[in-house]
């Protein structure tokens, strides 16, 4: 988890002087509770936006937006803590909006936004906005949270982001798998425009079962430049096991931008359809 760039982050708006600060996610008001605390955020919205860095890279970011409730507690609102928790790693990153002037009610509802948390493809986050100071131990909670899942690199809009392109999202191998005679598979795929090696991982399964009955790995050396974007054809020999008929072929590239952590593509060959046993035709037709 990180913030997009380190350019000046702005939270000021007409009628409010505000600064964005790094936060330890442990606001002082936890340790030194205040008697009067503000109410919780209203209408918290989390959206996926895309933002360019100063270097021109494109990253997915969490766009966080919320409004204030129209009650008197606005007079005691000193700021907000924005927290993003990545659920699979338990990593948390926080920033603090510090209000340098007192808020006053005005003709329209106060609205705040922040779009600088960089999020990763196919990751789930819990986004929390906490109004500050935080409540006393038995006080009503004054935060709002939402869980938010970022699409993976297969998604059309994600595919062109820098983290996805770095993991090989623009490569479409267009895999075809053909069953040959004598227990063989012919695998064909399109090479990318990089002189790097590939690995074909074959896993076979019995019909309707998920534990493998055969595994095989095939190494493909790095292509020469004249072979870029050409089809590569490989014939794999299967183990002659009756019923070991469903084959999953996975192609793992080793591009320089992602090494052994590149996006893999796969194709599956189903077991052949069992022909229905035909009804025996009777020798004679009964008359009744």
């Amino acid at each position: 988890l990180r913030l997009l760039d380190h350019r000046a982050l702005v939270c000021s708006q007409p009628g409010l002087n505000c600064t964005v600060k790094n936060s330890t996610c442990l606001d002082d008001s936890w340790i030194h509770p205040r008697n009067l605390t503000p109410s919780s955020p209203k209408d918290l919205q989390i959206q996926l936006h895309f933002a360019h860095t100063q270097q021109g890279d494109l990253f997915p970011v969490a766009h966080i937006e919320w409004t204030l409730q129209t009650d008197a507690s606005i007079l005691y609102l000193e700021g907000a803590e924005l927290s993003v928790l990545q659920l699979n790693t338990n990593e948390r990153l926080c920033v603090r909006f510090e209000f340098l002037s007192k808020l006053r009610h005005h003709h329209r509802r106060w609205r705040f936004t922040f779009s600088h948390f960089v999020v990763d493809p196919d990751q789930e986050y819990e986004v929390t906005v906490h109004h500050l100071p935080k409540p006393i131990p038995d006080g009503d909670p004054n935060h709002q949270s939402k869980n938010f899942l970022v699409p993976d690199c297969e998604h059309a809009r994600m595919k062109v982001t820098t983290p996805c392109m770095s993991s090989g999202s623009l490569w479409d191998p267009n895999i075809t798998v053909e069953t040959l005679e004598a227990h063989q598979l012919r695998v064909s795929f399109t090479l990318w425009n990089e002189s790097t090696h590939y690995q074909i991982l074959l896993t076979s399964f019995p019909h309707m079962e998920n534990h493998s009955c055969f595994e095989h790995m095939h190494h493909i050396p790095a292509p020469r430049p004249e072979e870029f974007h050409q089809r590569s054809n490989v014939t794999l020999t299967l183990r002659n096991l009756k019923g070991c008929c469903r084959h999953q072929v996975q192609i793992q590239p080793f591009f320089s931008s992602c090494l052994n952590d590149c996006l893999r593509h796969s194709a599956t060959v189903s077991c052949p359809e069992m022909p229905d046993t035909p009804e025996p035709i009777p020798d004679y037709m009964p008359l009744w």
Epitope: I46, Q47, A62, H63, K146, N147, L149, P151, A156, R157
Partner: nanobody
Framework: QVQLVESGGGLVQPGRSLRLSCAAS????????MHWVRQAPGKGLEWVSG????????DYVDTVKGRFTISRDNAKNSLYLQMNSLRAEDTALYYC????????????????????WGQGTMVTVSS
């Protein structure tokens, strides 16, 4: 124009099944997470189920888990809700809704982030 149209509602006996459909048009359906939300007579909106853009993640409110199944067919721009073992308390107007953003908001606090709603289809469970 951008719209969602639900169908498949009706009167059904307890324990029976219904399949709701939602036809989407006017936007890139396969980019967005989709949801089902219901409103029982005289009650507020209740989020029922959600599905990510590629069906990779699905979620349900606890009261329908194991009975309802959400699915989608991106080639047909369609969202579905298979409802089995229906109960009287499932009686409601069922809406399909599109997520405003490309991400997928998970759980019951998400309804305020939906920007397109259908007109709803009524499901009545009664003997």
């Amino acid at each position: 124009q951008v719209q969602l149209v639900e169908s498949g509602g009706g009167l059904v006996q307890p324990g029976r099944s219904l399949r709701l459909s939602c036809a989407a048009s006017g936007f890139s359906f396969d980019d967005y997470a989709m949801h089902w939300v219901r409103q029982a007579p005289g009650k507020g909106l209740e989020w029922v189920s959600g599905i990510s853009w590629n069906s990779g993640r699905v979620d349900y409110v606890d009261t329908v888990k194991g009975r309802f199944t959400i699915s989608r067919d991106n080639a047909k721009n369609s969202l579905y809700l298979q409802m089995n073992s229906l109960r009287a308390e499932d009686t409601a107007l069922y809406y399909c809704a599109k997520e405003r953003s490309l991400g997928y908001c998970r759980g019951g606090s998400c309804s305020d982030g939906f920007d397109i709603w259908g007109q709803g289809t009524m499901v009545t469970v009664s003997s």
